[in-house]
């Protein structure tokens, strides 16, 4: 059975989750990428992905979610932004492969978001302050709507805080550094 | 190939004003970070600021915070860096540079900033 | 931020020689670490990615390990090019901040 481990990040509403997740770069370089929301005994439940074929660095947002994709060097860059305490929960990257089940690619991130603005929006609590000139725009990612059903063999641990947002809108924002850990079958 | 070429380097009297200008070609411009790294005489490199693809989020080093200014022009693929109320230890070699994701993969030649009265 | 430190801060080698770089992190950064070479009067030059991935184009014998808070460039075969100054950049943590560097010089 495979071992399933988390990577705790502890950030303030405001901040940035600014996480690289890679993968083998002759395998998977241009296949769709997703992020992942899990839920207490729920699917896990996908609330962005890249376009298919990946585009090499190209942004794909989706509200305060932004997925960049770094073939050349096998990276898949997730950040959430102006994250809120109702962002807290458990995360993951996945690439999709049908009609295989979908690949995941690191330890899964436990993101807790607490009240208290740090006055640093950014990635990490080292984070520089940024400035936002545009309001984020949003891109309509189609995304595969099948998920694996072995992620959720095994409940995972009780989140600090449960991500409730309506299904047909995602107000995630500012995500931090999430950790990959090849996950072997 | 990936060229970056800086421009706008030049002698300043200290609180004066600086633009550096950043040419891009053989990538796609617009779908990349960019940054500014410098570094002072003899000594070792420093991030100094980045911007997004589009130009919505900006992010600097303390020590320039409200003195300096990252924009780009994705329709000339050019990347800026205004330097206002410049200081002797400003000076230094800047660089271009593109992120990818994990690093800067791209640079260019640098432009010379030396800031002296 | 993120301290990065390097050691030695100059070492003395011979073409042929084995040489090795350490680069500590004041905090985890997992893998996220590059290596970069650079010459007098000229850019940086990305070597390593990623701890250990190879950059397009760099000579194999140019390798690089670690994770965690130490990692390690290590350069199996001195070539006469390879006199140089190397700097470690951390990715992981904004903003992204760079070790002091190490000069390879010839013996």
């Known amino acids: 059975a495979t071992k399933l481990t988390e990577e705790k990040y502890e950030l303030k509403e405001g901040q940035t989750l600014d996480v690289k997740c890679d993968y083998t770069l002759e395998k998977f370089a241009s296949s769709q990428k997703a992020w992942q929301i899990i839920r207490d005994g729920e699917m896990p439940k996908t609330l962005a992905c890249t376009e298919r074929p990946s585009k090499n660095s190209h942004p794909v947002q989706v509200g305060r979610i932004i997925l960049e994709d770094y073939h050349d060097h096998g990276l898949l860059r997730v950040r959430m932004v102006n994250l809120q305490v109702e962002d807290s929960g458990l995360y993951q990257c996945v690439i999709y492969q049908p009609p295989k089940e979908p690949h995941m690619l690191f330890d899964r991130i436990r993101l807790v978001v607490t009240k208290g603005f740090s006055g640093t929006p950014g990635s990490n609590e080292n984070s520089t302050q940024n400035v936002y000139k545009i309001p984020p725009t949003t891109t309509k990612a189609l995304c595969p709507l099948y998920t694996s059903p072995r992620t959720v063999t095994q409940a995972p641990p009780k989140s600090t805080a449960d991500v409730s947002t309506p299904d047909s809108e995602i107000n995630l924002t500012n995500v931090t550094d999430i950790i990959r850990v090849p996950v072997f079958n | 190939e990936v060229q970056l070429v800086e421009s706008g380097g030049g002698l300043v009297q200290p609180g004066g004003s600086l633009r550096l200008s950043c040419a891009a070609s053989?990538?796609?411009?617009?779908?990349?970070?960019m940054s500014w790294v410098r570094q002072a005489p003899g000594k070792g490199l420093e991030w100094v600021a980045n911007i997004k693809q589009d130009g919505s989020e900006e992010y600097y080093v303390d020590s320039v915070k409200g003195r300096f200014t990252i924009s780009r022009d994705n329709a000339k693929n050019s990347l800026f860096l205004q330097m206002n109320s410049l200081r002797a230890e400003d000076t230094a070699v800047y660089y271009c540079?593109?992120?990818?994701?994990?690093?800067?993969?791209?640079w260019g030649q640098g432009t010379l900033v030396t800031v002296s009265s | 931020d993120i301290q990065m430190t390097q050691s030695p801060s100059s070492v003395s080698a011979s073409v042929g020689d084995r040489v090795t770089i350490t680069c500590r992190a004041s905090?985890?950064?997992?893998?996220?670490l590059a290596w970069y070479q650079q010459k007098p009067g000229r850019a940086p030059k990305l070597l390593i990615y990623a701890a250990s991935r190879l950059q397009s184009g760099v000579p194999s014998r140019f390798s690089g390990s670690g994770s965690g808070t130490d990692f390690t460039l290590t350069i199996s075969s001195l070539r006469p090019e390879d006199f140089a100054t190397y700097y470690c950049?951390?990715?992981?943590?904004?903003?992204?901040?760079f070790g002091q560097g190490t000069k390879v010089e010839i013996k």
């Open positions: 950049l951390q990715a992981h943590g904004f903003p992204w901040t």
């Open positions: 540079a593109r992120d990818y994701g994990d690093s800067f993969d791209y």
């Open positions: 905090q985890g950064i997992r893998k996220w």
């Open positions: 053989g990538f796609t411009f617009s779908s990349y970070w």
